[in-house]
Amino acid sequence: LVPHLGDREKRDSVCPQGKYIHPQNNSICCTKCHKGTYLYNDCPGPGQDTDCRECESGSFTASENHLRHCLSCSKCRKEMGQVEISSCTVDRDTVCGCRKNQYRHYWSENLFQCFNCSLCLNGTVHLSCQEKQNTVCTCHAGFFLRENECVSCSNCKKSLECTKLCLPQIENVKGTEDSGTT
């Protein structure tokens, strides 16, 4: 099966790499603009220069292109705990990340929030905290994992998933409760 090409891809594929078809004259291939620049005017004819201009402050293009406008620089989202790793330049978007001992949780493809790495108190570190994944903890006996924290089995209610992990403790508690005098 031949993949479906959009109009722009179709037009570009007629020209050699690094060039694009003139929008008003499909017999002319114009040179694309370098990253960090955008298309101001198409080339007037074959072998003539494309008029490319440098992106203004606050905008960028990260690859060769024939865009009429540069792309707006991303802003790091403070409310999500994000910090700026590197600022935007004409040829590279802002890079946002998290502070030390934090990881990124992606709520969607283009939205992440920074959270503190779990310390595995009352447990051991099974897998260390990574850039995009929290620490994986293994809890000590008498504790169960809830929201990535090791919680005492005394907080385990019968209806919760922890009953399997805390079964001996629950039996003990039940036994103690049932051993009242009649």
Partner: nanobody, 119 residues
Framework: EVRLLESGGGLVQPEGSLRLSCAAS????????MVWVRQAPGKGLEWVSH????????FYADSVKGRFTISRDNSKNTLYLQMNSLRAEDTAVYYC????????????RGQGTLVTVSS
């Protein structure tokens, strides 16, 4: 005690509009980033939009950008979601919530309001 109560859902035709509201109490609303998430039948929770305390630079999921508008009235402790040009794929239960702080789960979110887009 934190309370969040959504309202404004209902049945609407494609390309129609709805305005959801979320009445908040039990915390300092004006200090919190507020979130709208939704859950379509048989699907997981999807982040729709969020708005910081000062209402500056709200976030929108690509699927709703240009159609939905999030806003808040800090004097009324109320969050809003104006939904225009509704599509069948917007059918879901819509929840408002406080931006999670401890980890990637919602400690505080409402009971939800059902939005059905159908002709």
């Amino acid at each position: 005690e934190v309370r969040l109560l959504e309202s404004g859902g209902g049945l609407v035709q494609p390309e129609g509009s709805l305005r959801l509201s979320c009445a908040a109490s039990g915390f300092t609303f004006a200090h919190e980033t507020m979130v709208w998430v939704r859950q379509a039948p048989g699907k997981g929770l999807e982040w729709v939009s969020h708005i910081p305390p000062d209402s500056q630079d709200p976030f929108y999921a690509d699927s709703v950008k240009g159609r939905f508008t999030i806003s808040r009235d800090n004097s009324k402790n109320t969050l809003y979601l104006q939904m225009n040009s509704l599509r069948a794929e917007d059918t879901a239960v819509y929840y408002c919530g406080l931006l999670p702080k401890r980890g990637p789960w919602f400690d505080y979110r409402g009971q939800g309001t059902l939005v059905t887009v159908s002709s």
